[in-house]
């Protein structure tokens, strides 16, 4: 649910961590309606989730955490 | 309703481990995370580390990484936590508790009733 | 992490605050979540999304946020309510994501 590069709305799907290979962070005061995660997946898809979501800040520590021990 | 059994009470050695189980029951195993908190007497509440089964992915707090290995088996709906090289100061109630993961509110709904761990020579 | 007052009292009827102090990668920036843990029980959610009762919680306790800090209201007290009531947010950059403030315990007087 992108547009123009900016998230439009989030996914209702739950996506699993092994498929995702990094995020990009969309602040609604930077240009954007709304705060967003967004996903970038192995597919070289762009998914956009609600980065208020339980499932998705755990995704997002995980990563951060990866890329802190690298 | 969903509950989360936990197992009972356990007496350890300083430098042993021990391992404690969660089991879910009345509920599918998807789309919640399993966290453990603990409780030192006392003493206010602590996480230690959680899964996401269907991630099959666990996080552990800072001060427990290395020391403990948190596992998830679908099959029978339970969570594991071991912890390992215990100390004095490990001497806690060790509880249970639920997360839905696709809400935005980050609480603990469910709870279980806790398992004690005592620590001594 | 989240600072609370160790203590706070009241008598039955009257309204007691308990205050939760945090900083902006947790309270700032995600949601507030209220335990009550009666004696020699595991804890009970109270209050979460910052001012949100699951079902079954009595109205008389309410739940804001403003800010870095967060509070608690119990309306009404009674000799029930005499508890260790814990808040709890998730944290975006600590060590471990769920961080909890030590407790104040509710005297009934």
């Known amino acids: 649910a992108s547009n123009f590069d900016c998230c439009l709305g989030y996914t209702d799907r739950i996506l699993h961590p092994k498929f995702i290979v990094g995020f990009t962070r969309q602040l609604a005061n930077e240009g954007c309606d709304i705060n967003a995660i967004i996903f970038h997946t192995k597919k070289k898809l762009s998914v956009c989730a609600n980065p208020k979501q339980t499932w998705v800040k755990y995704i997002v520590r995980l990563l951060s955490k990866k890329v802190k021990n690298m | 309703e969903v509950q989360l059994v936990q197992s009972g009470a356990e007496v350890r050695k300083p430098g042993s481990s021990v391992k404690v189980s969660c089991k879910a029951s009345g509920d599918t195993f998807n789309n919640f995370a399993i966290s453990w908190v603990r409780q030192a007497p006392g003493h206010g509440l602590e996480w230690v580390g959680g899964i996401i089964p269907v991630f099959n992915t666990a996080d552990y707090a800072q001060n427990f990484t290395g020391r403990v290995t948190i596992s998830a088996d679908k099959a029978t709906k339970t969570v594991y936590m071991e912890l390992r090289s215990l100390r004095y100061d490990d001497t806690a109630v060790y509880f249970c508790?639920?997360?839905?993961?696709?809400?935005?509110?980050?609480?603990?709904?469910?709870w279980g009733r806790g398992t004690t761990v005592t620590v001594s020579s | 992490v989240l600072t609370q007052p160790p203590s706070a009292s009241g008598t039955p009827g009257q309204r007691v605050t308990i205050s939760c102090s945090g900083s902006?990668?947790?309270?700032?920036?995600?949601?507030v979540v209220w335990y009550q843990q009666l004696p020699g029980a595991a804890p009970k959610l109270l209050i979460y999304s910052n001012d949100q009762r699951p079902s079954g919680v009595p109205d008389r306790f309410s739940g804001s946020r403003s800010g870095t800090s967060a509070s608690l209201a119990i309306s009404g007290l009674q000799s029930e309510d005499e508890a260790d009531y814990y808040c709890?947010?998730?944290?975006?950059?600590?060590?471990?994501?769920?961080?909890f403030g030590g407790g104040t315990k509710v005297t009934v007087l």
């Open positions: 902006t990668s947790n309270i700032g920036s995600n949601a």
């Open positions: 709890a947010a998730w944290d975006d950059s600590r060590d471990g994501p769920w961080v």
């Open positions: 508790a639920r997360t839905k993961i696709e809400l935005d509110n980050d609480a603990f709904d469910i």
